[in-house]
């Protein structure tokens, strides 16, 4: 169950929840924001303060690390084969250092198997974060420190930090070093959603959501 | 430098089994994903497995699979290719191949192949 | 499965040519396209991987390009040592697969 199901069966307070895949007895603990745009929503990353290293393994990226309350990636296995048993929408939140916000809503959103490398798959973008996708299209398969996957010479994920779905390397990576304010400008390693802020604005938050297209 | 050495190749009647061999040097060996990929003689280029770094992940092409069985020892820097079932249509140089990465699906560098012959 | 169809099958060319190979899959492969040399009796040797990007040690006078379906790989001085027969694969998903081939011969 997701956090979508949390909340149909009456929970409907902000906080960390444990999930389970359907057929399975395998849990994760996640964050639920059970109040934005009608609740509901499982977080599947989350960037707030630096606190957690996000240069982690391919292994670390497939199970998830981090804390839900906090910073944390909810992990590629998991959110994969959630996407995979019905149809999910990608909500990406984000927050620059001058106290504005925007959003890109996919309405479509699921991650292949570790077959192809946890591959993304977007479909119908809308919101305020920009009109292109700062995500490449068609999506490429997820690249981490040691799990070389981009279609570069020069090593994105090496290079810009943090575990993402790169192409060479693309206009986003919301997974890259965490700046503080007056240092997150002409960053080319930061926290990038290029659509939005451009190729060196480093930003203050981003928060990574998924729920049922249906709930 | 990267060298990939392939043995055990050799003349194997229809229906028989062999095992063929590969020692990597020249690099992290347990960093790498590995691929088996095979030529009949004068023709193409087939593909047929690839092993994750760590041995997790295996993945078989369709003529192949449920008779081919790639593992590895990371300890021995040793890749391997077992045979069952063999055809005629087996018969090709067996090329042991590394990927560029943990599982890129890239062909990155090559061995230089070992030859099975299926005759009776 | 992804079919990959390789032309010409074979060409002939002189020292000097300029030589155009072309391979089309049957589905949006997504730049997932790598280029292989292969000389007579030798294991193949990787050229070009991600559709344009050379690799280490290959001279710039091999170049790839393409997107979607179709993709090229020129050579833009044909010296003795091209005459061999390239393979194109994608490795765009599983199972990979490999053209057919092209044979390029000195005329």
């Known amino acids: 169950r997701d956090c979508a199901e949390v909340f149909k069966s009456g929970h409907t307070t902000n906080g960390v929840y444990t999930l389970t895949l359907p057929n399975s007895t395998e849990e994760v603990k996640a964050y639920c924001d059970m109040e934005a745009g009608g609740g509901g929503w499982t977080i599947i990353q989350r960037r707030e303060d630096g606190s957690v290293d996000f240069q982690r393994t391919w292994k670390e990226y497939k199970v998830g690390f981090g804390n839900p309350s906090g910073e944390y990636w909810l992990g590629n296995e998991f959110v994969s084969q959630l996407t995979n048993q019905q149809r999910y929408v990608l909500k990406i939140h984000l927050k620059d250092w001058e106290g504005n916000e925007a959003y890109s809503l996919y309405e479509h959103f699921y991650l292949s198997s570790e077959e192809l490398n946890y591959r993304i798959h977007l479909k119908g973008l809308t919101g305020t974060a920009g009109k292109i996708s700062s995500i490449s299209q068609p999506g490429n398969d997820f690249s981490t420190k040691d799990a070389d996957n981009d279609k570069c010479i020069c090593k994105c994920s090496q290079m810009l930090t943090g575990g993402w779905w790169f192409d060479a390397c693309g206009p986003s990576n919301l997974n890259g070093m965490y700046y503080p304010q007056r240092q997150n400008t002409n960053k080319f390693n930061g926290i990038k959603w290029y659509y939005w802020k451009g190729s060196g604005y480093s930003l203050k938050g981003t928060t990574m959501m998924i729920r049922p297209a249906d709930f | 430098q990267v060298k990939l050495v392939e043995s055990g190749g050799g003349v194997v009647q229809p229906g028989r089994s062999l095992r063929v061999s590969c020692a990597a040097s020249?690099?992290?060996?347990?960093?790498?994903?590995m691929h088996w990929v095979r030529q009949a003689p004068g023709k193409g280029l087939e593909w047929l497995a690839i092993i994750w770094y760590d041995g997790d992940n295996k993945y078989y092409s369709d003529s192949v699979k449920g008779r081919f069985t790639i593992s590895r020892d990371n300890s021995k820097n040793t890749l391997y290719l077992q045979m069952n079932s063999l055809r005629a249509e087996d018969t090709a140089e067996y090329y042991c191949?590394?990927?560029?990465?943990?599982?890129?699906?890239?062909?990155?560098?090559w061995g230089q192949g070992t030859l099975v012959t299926v005759s009776s | 499965d992804i079919q990959m169809t390789q032309s010409p099958s074979s060409l002939s060319a002189s020292i000097g040519d300029r030589v155009t190979i072309t391979c089309r899959a049957t589905?949006?492969?997504?730049?997932?396209l790598a280029w292989f040399q292969q000389k007579p009796g030798k294991a193949p040797k990787s050229l070009i991987y991600a559709t344009s990007n050379l690799q280490s040690g290959v001279p710039s006078k091999f170049s790839g390009s393409g997107s979607g379906t179709d993709y090229t790989l020129t050579i833009s001085s044909l010296q003795p040592e091209d005459f061999s027969t390239y393979y194109c694969q994608q490795y765009h998903s599983y199972p990979l697969t490999f053209g057919g081939g092209t044979k390029v011969e000195i005329k």
């Open positions: 191949v590394r990927d560029a990465s943990i599982a890129s699906r890239f062909l990155d560098y």
């Open positions: 020249g690099f992290t060996f347990s960093s790498y994903g």
């Open positions: 589905q949006d492969i997504n730049n997932y």
